[in-house]
Interface confidence: low
C-alpha cells in the first residue's frame, strides 16, 4: 500500500485545516493507529494526536480542542485530522506515520501555510492646495502573510512608491500616492485596492480628494456702460468667482463707503435708482480659507441731459 | 452553527443611551471581525460599525462617528455597541453579524435583530 497526502494545505486565518493522510492499502490490510506529529526543521518533533482503531482520538495537551477528525461517515484506512481555527503559529511542517497491519509502517510529511489576509488602513496626507507641487495624497497599509499587493485605482494622474517591511510571519506594504493638486481633482475618488490570496475579492478604500483653490475674481454687470445712466433701476454688479472651500464674498468702495441704498447680497451689489453719487470705484473681496482675490470696477453714471447738452453741430466755415 | 443573539434595544428619548449586546454560540468567534448593521423602514440595511476579532481596530460609518463605541469581550463570545446621543434618525432595528475569516461581505452569520426606537 501507499500513503497519499498533499505536499502543501492552505488555509485562511482562522479556518480550519484539514490534514490529509489516507492509506491505500491491499485487500485485507487494516490501519492500526495514526500519530500526527509537528516536524519543524531543528526542532524535535511535537505529537499532534494519536487515532488508535480501538481507543479512539488521543490529542496532546498542547492542542486540546483544536485537533478532531472530520465528520462521519469515516473510512478506517483514513488518518486526516482537522486543525482548528489555524493560526500563524500554526504553520509548519507535519508528518503522519500510518500503522497497518501486515504491511508495517509508512510515513509522509506535509506543509501547513497559513494565509492572513490583510486588514488594510488608507490615511489621506497633508491638506492638497492647489500651486502644490507634487504632495502626497494618501498612503495605504496593509499586513499580512504573504505579503499583500497594495495598488491604487483612480482617474486622477499621480505616482506611486511602494515600500514593504518584513515581519517574522507577515509583511507590512505601503503605498503612497503624490500627485500635483488641481481645482480639477475636487470631489475624485482615490482607491486603494489591496489584493491577497487569503481574500475572496480584493479589498478596496476609498478616499475623496479635497484640493483647496480661489479662482481669479471678476465683476459682470457693466459689460454695456450706456445702461448706467441716471434714473436706471435695478442696476446690481455680480462679483464672479469659485473655490474650495465656496468662498465669501465682500463690497466696498474705493474712494468713499457705499452709498445709501446699495444693497449687498452675498456676491452681488444691488443699486436703487442710479445717480451721480453712484459714480466710483468699487470692488469686490473674495476670500476663503486657502487665498483672497480682489477685482474692481469703474462705475460711470451718465447723464443723458448732459450728454445732448455738450453735442455740438459742426458747421463748416470758409 | 453559529448563532448570534441581540438584546438591549428599545424605546429611548433623543439625546439618551442604549447598550446593545450579541452573544454567540455554537463557535468561538475570536479570530473573526464582527459588526453591527442597522435598518430602518423602508431603507437597506446599513452597516454601523465593525471591530477586528481581537478588538484593536473599529470602523464606523459617518453618521455615527462619536456617538456609537463597538468593543468585544471574546471571553464571553459577546459583542457590545454603545449608542449615546441618540437621536431620532437612529430608529432602525439593529442586527449583529460575524464576517467568518474576515473576508469579503457575503460570508456572513446574522442574528435576528433587536428594535432600538428614538422618540420623544
Known amino acids: 500500500g501507499e500513503l497519499e497526502t498533499s505536499d502543501v494545505v492552505t488555509v485562511v486565518l482562522g479556518q480550519d485545516a484539514k490534514l490529509p493522510c489516507f492509506y491505500r492499502g491491499d485487500s485485507g490490510e487494516q490501519v492500526g493507529q495514526v500519530a500526527w506529529a509537528r516536524v519543524d526543521a531543528g526542532e524535535g518533533a511535537q505529537e499532534l494526536a494519536l487515532l488508535h482503531s480501538k481507543y479512539g482520538l488521543h490529542v496532546s495537551p498542547a492542542y486540546e480542542g483544536r485537533v478532531e477528525q472530520p465528520p462521519p461517515p469515516r473510512n478506517p484506512l483514513d488518518g486526516s485530522v482537522l486543525l482548528r481555527n489555524a493560526v500563524q503559529a500554526d504553520e509548519g511542517e507535519y508528518e503522519c506515520r500510518v500503522s497497518t497491519f501486515p504491511a508495517g509502517s509508512f510515513q509522509a510529511r506535509l506543509r501547513l501555510r497559513v494565509l492572513v489576509p490583510p486588514l488594510p488602513s488608507l490615511n489621506p496626507g497633508p491638506a492638497l492646495e492647489e500651486g502644490q507641487g507634487l504632495t502626497l495624497a494618501a498612503s495605504c497599509t496593509a499586513e499580512g502573510s504573504p505579503a499583500p499587493s497594495v495598488t491604487w485605482d483612480t482617474e486622477v494622474k499621480g505616482t506611486t512608491s511602494s515600500r514593504s517591511f518584513k515581519h517574522s510571519r507577515s509583511a507590512a506594504v505601503t503605498s503612497e500616492f503624490h500627485l500635483v493638486p488641481s481645482r480639477s481633482m475636487n470631489g475624485q475618488p482615490l482607491t486603494c485596492v489591496v489584493s491577497h490570496p487569503g481574500l475572496l475579492q480584493d479589498q478596496r478604500i476609498t478616499h475623496i480628494l479635497h484640493v483647496s483653490f480661489l479662482a481669479e475674481a471678476s465683476v459682470r454687470g457693466l459689460e454695456d456702460q450706456n445702461l448706467w445712466h441716471i434714473g436706471r433701476e435695478g442696476a446690481m454688479l455680480k462679483c464672479l468667482s469659485e473655490g474650495q472651500p465656496p468662498p465669501s464674498y465682500n463690497w466696498t468702495r474705493l474712494d468713499g463707503p457705499l452709498p445709501s441704498g446699495v444693497r449687498v447680497d452675498g456676491d452681488t451689489l444691488g443699486f436703487p435708482p442710479l445717480t451721480t453719487e453712484h459714480s466710483g470705484i468699487y470692488v469686490c473681496h473674495v476670500s476663503n480659507e486657502f487665498s483672497s482675490r480682489d477685482s474692481q470696477v469703474t462705475v460711470d453714471v451718465l447723464d443723458p441731459q448732459e450728454d445732448s447738452g455738450k453735442q455740438v453741430d459742426l458747421v463748416s466755415a470758409s | 452553527e453559529v448563532q448570534l443573539l441581540e438584546s438591549g434595544g428599545g424605546l429611548v428619548q433623543p439625546g439618551g443611551s442604549l447598550r446593545l449586546s450579541c452573544a454567540a454560540s455554537g463557535r468561538t468567534l475570536s479570530s473573526y471581525a464582527m459588526g453591527w448593521y442597522r435598518q430602518a423602514p423602508g431603507k437597506e440595511r446599513e452597516l454601523v460599525s465593525s471591530i477586528s476579532g481581537s478588538g484593536g481596530s473599529t470602523r464606523y460609518a459617518d453618521s455615527v462617528k462619536g456617538r456609537f463605541t463597538i468593543s468585544r469581550d471574546n471571553s464571553k463570545n459577546t459583542l457590545y455597541l454603545q449608542m449615546n446621543s441618540l437621536k431620532p434618525e437612529d430608529t432602525a432595528v439593529y442586527y449583529c453579524?460575524?464576517?467568518?475569516?474576515?473576508?469579503?461581505?457575503?460570508?456572513?452569520?446574522w442574528g435576528q435583530g433587536t428594535q432600538v426606537t428614538v422618540s420623544s
Open positions: 453579524a460575524v464576517y467568518i475569516l474576515e473576508l469579503a461581505p457575503g460570508a456572513e452569520y
